[in-house]
Amino acid sequence: KKVVLGKKGDTVELTCTASQKKSIQFHWKNSNQIKILGNQGSFLTKGPSKLNDRADSRRSLWDQGNFPLIIKNLKIEDSDTYICEVEDQKEEVQLLVFGLTANSDTHLLQGQSLTLTLESPPGSSPSVQCRSPRGKNIQGGKTLSVSQLELQDSGTWTCTVLQNQKKVEFKIDIVVLAFQKASSIVYKKEGEQVEFSFPLAFTVEKLTGSGELWWQAERASSSKSWITFDLKNKEVSVKRVTQDPKLQMGKKLPLHLTLPQALPQYAGSGNLTLALEAKTGKLHQEVNLVVMRATQLQKNLTCEVWGPTSPKLMLSLKLENKEAKVSKREKAVWVLNPEAGMWQCLLSDSGQVLLESNIKVLPTW
């Protein structure tokens, strides 16, 4: 008996061939001997089966002695043995229909788990193997689970169902809802305008939800909500914003915040959360602000940074085109009695300058 695997919702074509290459009478029945489909001349005839409006054939093939049974919009319960009767002979085909679906939704938040469930006909014992977009393989029986979804899990999952040495392939598009970056650092000189951007790693037609930016300033004892906003069909509207600092927010995606001035009291780290409509859980992105200030007070030239810096960052003071006068893994450096000229304060990581502030020291008479 020939075995054919089908996918729920798809179309399958079961073949039946006569030795005579001409249009002759045929009919297809199910295992209960209920007539599904046959022919009379150039026309199709249909029996009282459940497949009535989903069964078809190809009249163009009849005169070649081919009498296929086409079943559209396959259902699991279409799994059965189908019998083609033609020229006093019977051809049997066993059809097994499988379905593979994602647990709730194919749009999942980063960190959530994905469960794929296999629907299969009674008596079958299939095995399933799925390959994620990043090439990770998972195997299982009726259910497959992947915990802690990552951004790289977004894309097409290819799942192969094996039964009777035959296989059928499913493709499921999974969208992991997340920000493009989990964390970002903005380095600014005191007084500069600060731009915070929170690009999303996915695109959906309609995006609705609400969000908030909480800020923990380095100098403050507790965190504070800087701004709350709503998102409706990709349009952003501010609900509430603090007086200090007075943040501005872009009206369109990607989420964009502007801080008029970088000041030492704002240096710190923030957490932007976005709650999407009809989703449990929130999207998070951490953002950090490092502020630099270079000052000269009497005979003391000082360079300071505020905010979350890594211990391996180097802070240096140097006269233009000269070697660094002072260079330390600290958040403040100074030079006493600096000579006249253009001094540079540099914050660098392994030789790469992250932030630079220039200050002119005038000659003392």
Partner: antibody, heavy 121, light 108 residues
């Protein structure tokens, strides 16, 4: 050109039979079905059945089974439809139409002008 | 048997207007098996469309067929004087072949 020429109008009494002919020309008669469709005055079209001129195989709707006979004479490229046990509701125009099977498509592309059959006592 | 229902029964329009005729099948059929015919008073029907959307030989482009499943449509983009007639849809998904009751397109 391709055409189907039908026999003339008939007036019949209830219980009688009528035989309508349909002569094909301009194409190979045995390559296409001949379908029979009727239309009562002011009413819609009603398909009755068909004959395959090549094999002689026929088929008709359940409504007419036992009362309708569809035949053909290939030597004169003519198809016939005979309806017996006539009743007044069989009063209608009877059309023959060529049935074309092109790939998976089937359609009636050439029609006769129709034969009026009146059943009246 | 599959019952074909056409609507509206009558459509009153002026030349140049767009006509939209509907045909609904009592069960889902493949678009392969849907034809449209035109019939003028005292004449035999004439094939317009087969396979739901393929125009028959010599049929002007203003006639357009569409649809799938149970709902099919014949659209005449700009009615010409010669288009005022009765239009029938017909299925050959399986025996018996059945016609719709027809839609009469008349001059307003």
């Amino acid at each position: 050109q391709v055409q189907l020429v039908q026999s003339g109008a008939e007036v019949k009494k209830p219980g009688a039979s009528v035989k309508v002919s349909c002569k094909a020309s301009g194409y190979t008669f045995t390559s296409y079905d001949i379908n029979w469709v009727r239309q009562a005055t002011g009413q819609g079209l009603e398909w009755m059945g068909w004959v395959n001129p090549n094999s002689g195989n026929t088929g008709s709707t359940q409504k007419f089974q036992g009362r309708v006979t569809m035949t053909r004479n290939t030597s004169i490229s003519t198809a016939y439809m005979e309806l017996s046990s006539l009743r007044s509701e069989d009063t209608a125009v009877y059309y023959c139409a060529r049935g074309v099977l092109k790939g998976d498509y089937y359609y009636m592309d050439v029609w006769g002008k129709g034969t009026t059959v009146t059943v009246s006592s | 048997e599959i019952v074909m229902t056409q609507s509206p029964a009558t459509l009153s329009l002026s030349p140049g207007e767009r006509a939209t005729l509907s045909c609904r099948a009592s069960q889902s059929i493949s678009s392969t098996y849907l034809s449209w015919y035109q019939q003028k008073p005292g004449q035999a029907p004439r094939l317009l469309i087969y396979g739901s959307s393929t125009r028959a030989t010599g049929i002007p482009a203003r006639f357009r067929g569409s649809g799938s499943g149970t709902d099919f449509t014949l659209t005449i983009s700009s009615l010409q004087p010669e288009d005022f007639a009765v239009y029938y849809c017909q299925q050959d998904d399986h025996l018996p072949l059945t016609f719709g009751g027809g839609t009469k397109v008349e001059i307003k």
